[in-house]
């Protein structure tokens, strides 16, 4: 299956060139997507190429600049946000990254009515998070771990919380572990639909052990970075949820939302908050042992100005075969009656599907079914439900958008995207305007990405928003590798794989093989998406075959595959990579003396264990920022899949699954170990311990550290990293430079 733009004439072959490493490092062949910033049913904002903020009206076809690039430049703004009443715009500048999602910035408020910046009662700096209310122009923001409210941008702020303290108490923003492993956001506050109430989380990290590492910088003495970071089995943050009336915030103050009794009886997490109406809110909670989740619907009791969460409105989701949910527990999408909702969870056959819950989970009505999975519910309107799944043609690595008519009986299902641009587009996401009047489709591949605008009633394409013409032209003289997505059937397990083949691939020849692995629980590497990246270069220029394999533990193929790794990380993921390699060798075009494996993060863990499997299959391999022991990684993530590192739980497998325990087995492979010293996520400690174990076992290996770099190894480190890894692989495969 060739998933690349087709060539016009073979005679052009000689004018074509292979990809270079420089192409990849320069981002020469990066693509653009277009996500409208919807501001109504038929209007959206977009930042033009020359940095003007332009408002587009789909129905009138008109557009006008609401904020000029001159205004943006006057404060060096890199981002903006229009207030819902369209009177003000916040301008964001001085962006300073913190963790994966979090950053601080300086905010300026621009008054569109008089064309001036709001003076007086300016916002403090730097701000950790800022957002408009959903209606009007109230502002909520977090500064120094406390939440503030402004009724209007020029008003003095009202301080909602007072106990915020760096690394101790976080209000309205998550601590490290909640940001990375639970919420996946930089914020932990939520406006009610009409802005009457503001809900927020308070995280108390007082008792959490701290990870400390050196940041070398340029000074005479390094700084020490301290982060409250609960590793597996350690003390966790204590979370509380509060709601405040933003119209009259002072009198009653924040009211705590009660935790369901069955959750509060032991350690627990808050997992998400969904407003239903201004006076109804839905909270999701999770036991620390993450196989029980409770969805709690709470109502405002006006007489007491409190929130009541009756037991009759508690819905329990429990997994008996693994953990609750996929990567996260899914969130509900409420219907117009403001009590029933749609939610994705496992059906009786162990596939994640959409269910409709009206009274109890036990009486849920299954909306989708089959040996495939519903992946995301985008929007529920009065008559339609839009969702994505990997149903079409039974390819788990595809995403198509479907519409189910819920207004009619029986409900009818239509695939909106399956036949739009079938060869080019098999992996979609969508972005909907208010009431799903219009929507944008963003196709990520396998062909060159394209973004289009559609009518929400008829699904007709209205216009192309971005088609990456420049990229298409730039690729015309590039010899791109061929890509295949196929499956292996082994011992009742289906192993989907993507193989990236050199442009002049010849099955009768032998090629070096590089396995790229991630393999983490609920991940998916074999996806029908477009990419011109490092492995594209290795295939195009260096003549390698690259393979990605989704083994046990990966997502969207049912619970049997997903939960196979439960409480046993580091076993089946590795076995399945090895099994796939053996199958690839049987295909006849792999040089079995030149097989390598590489991975980053969880992939670094799997590649390390594969190299140390003692199979003799791998000549060499690379681990970038690997986990080396699950005792070193974050509680929320690790315990979800592994339970607790205690004698009466799963300590034995925690100990058995370390990379260090297999140090001896690295003797017969070439191993390159790479890590950033300022990795806040997978701590440098992981690689330090691998290195120590290898030294103690007197095993030779290669290593590279990146000073002051985090888990992403960004900037100039990226160039150095890929250059270094390229040299290592070429040397391993005896390829000339």
């Amino acid at each position: 299956i060739v998933l690349r733009p087709s060539r016009v004439h073979n005679s052009e072959e000689n004018t074509m060139r292979a990809l270079t490493l420089k192409d990849i490092l320069n981002g020469t062949f990066s693509y653009k997507t277009f996500f409208p910033n919807w501001i109504s049913g038929q209007e959206y904002l977009h930042q033009s190429a020359d940095n003007n903020i332009v408002l587009y009206n789909i129905e009138t076809g008109q557009s006008y600049t609401i904020l000029s690039n001159r205004t943006m430049k006057s404060v060096n703004a890199s981002n903006y946000g229009l207030s819902p009443d369209r009177q003000f715009v916040y301008l964001e500048s001085d962006y300073s990254k913190l963790w994966r999602y979090s950053y601080t910035a300086t905010y300026y408020i621009y008054d569109l009515s008089n064309g001036e910046f709001v003076r007086g009662n300016e916002l403090p700096r730097p701000i950790q998070y800022l957002c408009w209310s959903p209606v009007g122009s109230k502002l909520a923001y977090v500064y120094q771990n406390n939440i503030y409210l402004k009724q209007r941008p020029g008003d003095p702020p009202f301080q909602i919380t007072f106990n915020g303290r760096e690394n101790k108490i976080f209000n309205g923003i998550p601590d490290w572990v909640y940001e990375e492993e639970m919420l996946a956001t930089k914020y932990a506050l939520w406006w009610s639909p009409n802005g009457k109430f503001l809900a927020y989380a308070e995280f108390n990290d007082t008792d959490i052990p701290v990870i400390a590492y050196s940041y070398y910088g340029d000074e005479q003495y390094p700084r020490t970075i301290n982060i409250p970071y609960p590793k597996a089995g350690a003390k966790n943050p204590v979370v509380r949820i509060f709601i405040i009336d933003t119209t009259y915030p002072a009198y009653v103050g924040p009211q705590e939302v009660p935790v369901p009794a069955m959750i509060a009886s032991s350690d627990y997490y808050f997992s998400w908050l969904t407003w239903v109406t201004d006076e109804r809110v839905c909270l999701q909670w999770l036991k620390r042992v993450q196989n029980v989740s409770v969805l709690s619907i709470c109502d405002f009791r006006e007489d007491w100005q409190t929130w009541d969460c009756p037991k009759t409105q508690e819905h329990i989701e429990e997994s008996r075969t693994g953990w609750a949910g996929g990567f996260f527990v899914s969130t509900p999408v409420f219907s117009y009656d403001a009590i029933s909702y749609y939610k994705i969870f496992s059906d009786k056959d162990g596939y994640k599907h959409i269910h409709y819950i009206k009274d109890t989970v036990e009486n849920a009505i299954q909306i989708t079914s089959g040996k495939w999975e519903a992946i995301n519910i985008f929007r529920v309107t009065q008559d339609s439900l839009f969702y994505s799944s990997n149903e079409f043609e039974e390819y788990p690595g595809r995403r198509n958008i479907y519409r189910i008519s819920i207004g009619s009986y029986p409900p009818s299902k239509k695939c909106v995207t399956c036949h739009l641009r079938k060869e080019r587009c098999q992996y979609y996401t969508a972005s909907f305007s208010d009431y799903a009047k219009y929507y944008a489709l963003v196709c990520y591949g396998p062909g060159i990405p394209i973004s289009t605008l559609h009518d929400g009633r008829t699904d007709q394409e209205i216009k192309i928003l971005e088609e990456n013409k420049e990229l298409e032209n730039a690729l015309k003289n590039i010899q791109l590798p061929k890509e295949e997505i196929k499956k292996l059937e082994v011992d009742e397990i289906t192993l989907w794989y993507k193989m990236i083949l050199p442009p002049q691939f010849d099955r009768s020849k032998k090629y070096p093989l590089l396995i790229q692995v991630y393999g983490g629980p609920c991940s998916q590497s074999v996806r029908s998406v477009f990419a011109v990246n490092w492995i594209s270069y290795l295939a195009s220029k260096e003549g390698m075959v690259i393979a990605l394999v989704d083994g046990r533990g990966t997502a969207f193929q049912g619970d049997k595959l997903l939960y196979a790794v439960y409480r046993k990380l580091g076993v089946y993921e590795v076995e399945d990579q090895i099994t796939a390699v053996r199958k690839f060798i049987e295909m006849g075009f792999i040089d079995e003396k030149r097989i390598a494996i590489w991975g980053w993060s969880y992939g670094g863990y799997v590649s390390s264990l594969a190299l140390a499997s003692g199979t003799g299959l791998f000549k060499c391999g690379i681990a970038v920022a690997p986990v080396s022991s699950w005792e070193y990684y974050a509680s929320v993530y690790t315990e979800r899949f592994m339970g607790l590192p205690t004698k009466d739980d799963n300590l034995e497998h925690y100990k058995n699954s370390t990379v260090m325990a297999r140090a001896e087995y690295f003797r017969n492979v070439d191993y390159l170990l790479i890590h950033g010293t300022a990795d806040d996520n997978v701590h440098f400690q992981n690689s330090a311990q691998i290195a120590k174990a290898l030294v103690n076992a007197q095993v030779d290996f290669q290593a590279m550290w990146y000073s002051d770099q985090n888990h992403g190894l960004s900037g100039l480190s990226t160039n150095h990293l890929y250059t270094h890894m390229t040299h290592f692989l070429k040397q391993c495969f005896s390829l000339s430079d």
């Epitope: 009202f158 009653v252 103050g253 007491w304």
Partner: antibody, heavy 122, light 107 residues
């Protein structure tokens, strides 16, 4: 110096409506920092909060009395009033008006009127 | 409603004594607790807010502490003018509720 003064009839018949007014002097009722409240104390008993009002008219009431209580404000006169209908003997008490300061939180009653005894009797 | 329970209901003490009155809330009220003093025939007088902050003009022999559900009012050295009834009051939620009072009498 802020002063609060309750006024109104000292005797109300059962089932009728108790009406009291609190006049604020030495300061404006139209401040965003205060609510203005009514608290009562039956003879020989403890204190019971009735309700509070903001100068804009936003009110909070004790749920146990809410169905019978109305508190209103007249900013032009610097006054706020209490109406309690369908009274019984159990409503006999000294009625206090007070200023409730709300910023910074928490709310507390820092200035009180001297109180007026209202007896419910036929 | 949040119930406020004071103990003791009454106590006898002498001038110069250290007196402690406790107030317990039926659920957590954070630090949102206030103390008042009332003398017979008079309106209550405000003493302490936010559990421990002394109102200006209130003698420093009065102090408050606690958070969550348990709070105390302490008079370090009882003076003749301190004989009165003391009330705690929570302002964490609606309705505002008072304790039943603690009467401090002369021994």
């Amino acid at each position: 110096q802020l002063q609060l003064q309750e006024s109104g009839p000292g005797l109300v018949k059962p089932s009728e409506t108790l009406s009291l007014t609190c006049t604020v002097s030495g300061g404006s009722i139209s401040s965003s920092t205060y609510y203005w409240g009514w608290i009562r104390q039956p003879p020989g008993k403890g204190l019971e909060w009735i309700g509070s009002i903001f100068y804009s008219g936003n009110t909070y009431y004790n749920p146990s009395l809410k169905s019978r209580v109305t508190i209103s404000v007249d900013t032009s006169k610097n006054q706020f009033s209490l109406r309690l209908n369908s009274v019984t003997a159990a409503d006999t008490a000294v009625y206090y008006c007070a200023r409730e300061i709300i910023e910074p939180r928490p709310g507390y009653f820092d200035y009180w009127g001297q109180g007026t005894l209202v007896t419910v009797s036929s | 409603d949040i119930q406020m329970t004071q103990s003791p209901s009454s106590l006898s003490a002498s001038v110069g004594d250290r007196v402690t009155i406790t107030c317990r809330a039926s659920q957590s009220i954070s630090k949102y607790l206030n103390w008042y003093q009332q003398k017979p025939g008079k309106a209550p007088k405000f003493l302490i807010y936010a559990a421990s902050s002394l109102q200006s003009g209130v003698p420093s022999r009065f102090s408050g502490s606690g958070s969550g559900t348990d709070f105390t009012l302490t008079i370090s050295s009882l003076q003749p003018e301190d004989f009165a009834t003391y009330y705690c009051q929570q302002s964490n939620s609606i309705p505002r509720t008072f304790g039943q009072g603690t009467k401090v009498e002369i021994k």
